[in-house]
C-alpha cells in the first residue's frame, strides 16, 4: 500500500536568463528511495540513482546541474523552458511516486515562487 | 564484447531450492543493475527482481518475496539468484539481463543471458 | 500492478508488409515502455526504449509511438528475420510488467 506523500515546489517563475532549483521531497513512507527521475514533459533530464549517482541526459548536460540533493537546477533558463516538470520518485516496496511542477520563464525582472502543495 | 554468461541446465524436486549463476563480462560490472526475468514453457516473461552489484541492494516482485534471493560476488562478476521452495509451475526458463545505461528502468534491459532451464519434477 | 494488454496475440504477414502491434496500460506509465524481439530458444533483444528511442544497432524499419497509455510499435517493412515474438515492458512503476506477447508468423 502506497502511503507517502510528494511535496513539491508547486507552481514557480523565474528570469530568463537566470536559473531555478526544481525540488520535491517524500514524505510520511519508510520505502527505500531506488531512483528519482526528473522529466520536462516527455523529455528525461535527469536520473539520480542511489547507488550509482546522477545521470544527466546529453541533451541538458550544459544547462542542468544535479542538486541540491535529489533536486535538479536548471541553469540559462529561456521562454521554452516553461512548462510542466515531473519528478519520479522510483521506491521500494511501494513502487512509484510522482510530483509535478510548473515553471513559467519571465522575460520580465519580477517572478515570483509559487506556493507549496501536496500531491498524495 | 559485453556478455552475460548463466550456468546450465537444472533438475530439481519439489520443496528444493535452485541456485542459477549469472556471469558478467567485457564491461564495468559494478555499473549496471541486473534484473532476472523467466518464461515459463510457452508463457511470456516475468519480471522476478532486481539487484545492484554496487551495494547489493535489492527489489523483488511481490510474486516471489520470501522465496528469492539475488546476491552478487563482485570479485568474480557474478550475480545470482536463489529460488526457494520449488513447485512445479516454477518449472522455466530463468533469464539475467542488465539494465542499460547505469540507471534503473528508463533504458530497458539491453543485455540478456543465454537463460537456464530450470525443471521442477517428482 | 500495472497491467500491459497486447494486441493481437498473433498475427500472419507477408515479407515487405507494413506491421503493427499494440500494448495498451492500464494506468498512466509516461513513456516508460520497452519492446522487445524474442525468436524460440532465445532470450529476447531490446528493439525500442522509452516507447520511441531506437536501441543502437537495431534496424531503422523498427519504430515506437506512444498516444497517452497507448503504445504501438511498428515493422515498416517485414523482413525474414523479423518472424519472432515480440513484448512489450513497463517500467514505469514494480513490479516490472510485460505485455502477453505478439507472434508474427509467416503467412
Known amino acids: 500500500m502506497m502511503t507517502g506523500t510528494i511535496e513539491t515546489t508547486g507552481n514557480i517563475s523565474a528570469e530568463k536568463g537566470g536559473s531555478i532549483i526544481l525540488q520535491c521531497h517524500l514524505s510520511s513512507t519508510t520505502a527505500q528511495v531506488t531512483q528519482v527521475n526528473w522529466e520536462q514533459q516527455d523529455q528525461l533530464l535527469a536520473i539520480c540513482n542511489a547507488d550509482l549517482g546522477w545521470h544527466i541526459s546529453p541533451s541538458f548536460k550544459d544547462r542542468v546541474a544535479p542538486g541540491p540533493g535529489l533536486g535538479l537546477t536548471l541553469q540559462s533558463l529561456t521562454v521554452n523552458d516553461t512548462g510542466e516538470y515531473f519528478c519520479i520518485y522510483h521506491t521500494y516496496p511501494d513502487g512509484t511516486y510522482t510530483g509535478r511542477i510548473f515553471l513559467e520563464v519571465l522575460e520580465s525582472s519580477v517572478a515570483e515562487h509559487g506556493a507549496r502543495f501536496q500531491i498524495p | 564484447q559485453v556478455q552475460l554468461v548463466q550456468s546450465g541446465a537444472e533438475v530439481k524436486k519439489p520443496g528444493a531450492s535452485v541456485k542459477v549463476s549469472c556471469k558478467a563480462s567485457g564491461y564495468t560490472f559494478t555499473g549496471y543493475y541486473i534484473h532476472w526475468v523467466r518464461q515459463a514453457p510457452g508463457q511470456g516473461l516475468e519480471w522476478m527482481g532486481w539487484i545492484s552489484p554496487t551495494s547489493g541492494a535489492t527489489g523483488y516482485a511481490q510474486n516471489f518475496q520470501g522465496r528469492v534471493t539475488m546476491t552478487r560476488d563482485t570479485s568474480i562478476t557474478t550475480a545470482y539468484m536463489e529460488l526457494s521452495r520449488l513447485r512445479s509451475d516454477d518449472t522455466a526458463v530463468y533469464y539475467c539481463?542488465?539494465?542499460?545505461?547505469?540507471?534503473?528502468?528508463?533504458?530497458?534491459?539491453?543485455?540478456w543471458g543465454q537463460g537456464t532451464t530450470v525443471t521442477v519434477s517428482s | 500492478d500495472i497491467e500491459m494488454t497486447q494486441a493481437p496475440s498473433s498475427l500472419s504477414a507477408s515479407v515487405g508488409d507494413r506491421v503493427t502491434i499494440t500494448c495498451r496500460a492500464s494506468?498512466?506509465?509516461?513513456?516508460?515502455l520497452n519492446w522487445y524481439q524474442q525468436k524460440p530458444g532465445k532470450a529476447p533483444k531490446l528493439l525500442i526504449y522509452a516507447a520511441s528511442s531506437l536501441q543502437n544497432g537495431v534496424p531503422s524499419r523498427f519504430s515506437g509511438s506512444v498516444s497517452g497509455t497507448d503504445f504501438t510499435l511498428t515493422i515498416s517493412s517485414l523482413q525474414p528475420e523479423d518472424f519472432a515474438t515480440y513484448y512489450c515492458?513497463?517500467?514505469?512503476?514494480?513490479?516490472?510488467?510485460f505485455g502477453g506477447g505478439t507472434k508474427v508468423g509467416i503467412r
Open positions: 515492458q513497463q517500467s514505469y512503476s514494480t513490479p516490472l510488467t
Open positions: 494506468q498512466t506509465i509516461r513513456r516508460y
Open positions: 539481463a542488465r539494465d542499460s545505461n547505469s540507471v534503473l528502468y528508463y533504458y530497458g534491459m539491453d543485455v
